[in-house]
Interface confidence: low
Amino acid sequence: PHLRTFTDRFQTCKVQGAWPLIDNNYLNVQVTNTPVLPGSAATATSKLTIIFKNFQECVDQKVYQAEMDELPAAFVDGSKNGGDKHGANSLKITEKVSGQHVEIRAKYIGTTIVVRQVGRYLTFAVRVPEEVVNAVEDWDSQGLYLCLRGCPLNQQIDFQAFHTNTEGTGARRLAAASPAPTAPETFPYETAVAKCKEKLPVEDLYYQACVFDLLTTGDVNFTLAAYYALEDVKMLHSNKDKLHLYERTRDLPGR
Amino acid sequence: SPCKILKCNSEFWSATSGSHAPASDDTPEFCAALRSYALCTRRTARTCRGDLAYHSAVHGIEDLMSQHNCSKDGPTSQPRLHTLPPAGDSQERSDSPEICHCEKSFHKHSATPNYTHCGLFGD
């Protein structure tokens, strides 16, 4: 999947299986990524687990789990708030669009999470105070925590290079260099560009991600995934000057 | 061990003379001792990762608070934390920091925080 980190680095990761996105004293988020096509290196998120840790007088530990074709509007125990404590309503799940869009607000830690199902796969976005991000017991054992450190270099796909290589060509040309098997022949580069431009008029990294996804999979739902990801940034990012990210040299993952 | 949970426990035991079932007229003192105990555990949280006594204490304080109808707010023998503990190496960073009014949004408890964003989508 495409990852925008807490430090506004933008990466395309081929990480497969379960990986931690966030892990601190209050919140743990883990994603499971699966290949989008058999044999493909490109992966998308098929499962998401969010654990809101027990927080003294405010909330009981609550676990939220979403999977492909299952975007519940409740925690795994069936509740929609933080439990029986007097501050339980400082953690709330709201269903925005049934089966497609859920928002979780954890007021006690100033955090908003948006989970969507777009096509077969899930998207995730969070707004969280730096103070909460930094509330970890032991920095040295934090390991690979994607939102903070990004993907390991050997798990990144340089999709910007594919974007450059494929301008004016069809999917057949991309397939030779692509991390995925040949996408449907009926999806030329020009069509991908047109479909992405329709939803993402600014040629930023979200637009480029959209083009990459369409050429890699032939699945038009990925257009919407990029569109909603940008919409979520508009809602959640505190720096309005950083909504759009533009092409630049690929970052090394953070320490 | 740098984890000072046993010190917190013994201070609590001294303060309550080893009694966990005080007479009703002792309850204010017992609750004050519990709040001091809670504060002590928060202060040592950072160095108590994986320590059984620490995690047992955190849960037990909550149990005892409710058993004896102690309010979270009230006198202690030490100053109290009302905010999320600061980041960095502060001794007061904690597993389960206390916020007095969960319902109020986060920035009521500290200066307006710097927010940050992370997102994951597509392939």
Partner: antibody
Framework: EVQLVQSGAEVKKPGASVKVSCKAS????????ISWVRQAPGQGLDWMGW????????NYAQKLQGRVTMTTDTSTSTAYMELSSLRSEDTAVYYC?????????????WGQGTLVTVSS | QSALTQPRSVSGSPGQSVTISCTGT?????????VSWYQQHPGKAPKLMLY???KRPSGVPDRFSGSKSGNTASLTISGLQAEDEADYYC?????????FGGGTKVTVL
């Protein structure tokens, strides 16, 4: 009723791994730690380690470090203990036990035990 | 060898009192409030009898009592009964280690 129900007996070859489960019911799983204790035939009790379902923190007996892994699944209120590189001296009954919550420390509820036999 | 030392066995007639000792160091027993005692009948799981040196969980008869002096914790069974015949283990929590005694076989004569 507070209960811990463990998985059935296992027979393993030396060098293999075993994973024992312990399903909790009748209480809030995340409010108490789970300890694992083993007892070799005719011997005393031997503490293996502890896990907090609340935080995921673990605390293993020094002599088992590197061979034992304790995990929990809060969605099913189940604790797991995996022991690798088994040797004949690991033959024992393995118990899970709930750790009493609080400034109190004790093991107040025990599973029925799982016999693990390591034999070639 | 266990970190806490218990006598291998003690015995007494019905109605008598028996005391089982559990000796450790100042850090494992002397300074610890976390000493607990467990009863185990053959083929059964252990059962908590006392915790935090002196406290009795509900359901445990009051003939079981605990004390501590220096680096030695003790379990006393007063008014011994036939069903008290079992193995008894002490446990102390010290730092991040849980220490077991080797166990004491109580025989009712």
């Amino acid at each position: 009723e507070v209960q811990l129900v463990q998985s059935g007996a296992e027979v393993k070859k030396p060098g293999a791994s075993v994973k024992v489960s312990c399903k909790a019911s009748g209480y809030t799983f995340t409010s108490h730690g789970i300890s694992w204790v083993r007892q070799a035939p005719g011997q005393g009790l031997d503490w293996m380690g502890w896990i907090s379902p609340y935080s995921g923190n673990t605390n293993y007996a020094q002599k088992l470090q590197g061979r034992v892994t304790m995990t929990t699944d809060t969605s099913t209120s189940t604790a797991y203990m995996e022991l690798s590189s088994l040797r004949s001296e690991d033959t024992a009954v393995y118990y899970c036990a709930r750790v009493g919550s609080g400034p109190y420390y004790y093991m107040d509820v025990w599973g029925q035990g799982t016999l693990v036999t390591v034999s070639s | 060898q266990s970190a806490l030392t218990q006598p291998r066995s003690v015995s007494g007639s019905p109605g008598q009192s028996v005391t089982i000792s559990c000796t450790g160091t100042s850090s494992s027993v002397g300074d610890s409030i976390y000493v607990s005692w467990y009863q185990q009948h053959p083929g059964k799981a252990p059962k908590l009898m006392l915790y935090d040196v002196t406290k009795r969980p509900s359901g445990v008869p009051d003939r079981f009592s605990g004390s501590k002096s220096g680096n030695t914790a003790s379990l006393t069974i007063s008014g011994l009964q036939a069903e008290d015949e079992a193995d008894y283990y002490c446990i102390s929590y010290a730092g991040t280690d849980t220490l077991f005694g080797g166990g004491t076989k109580v025989t009712v004569l």
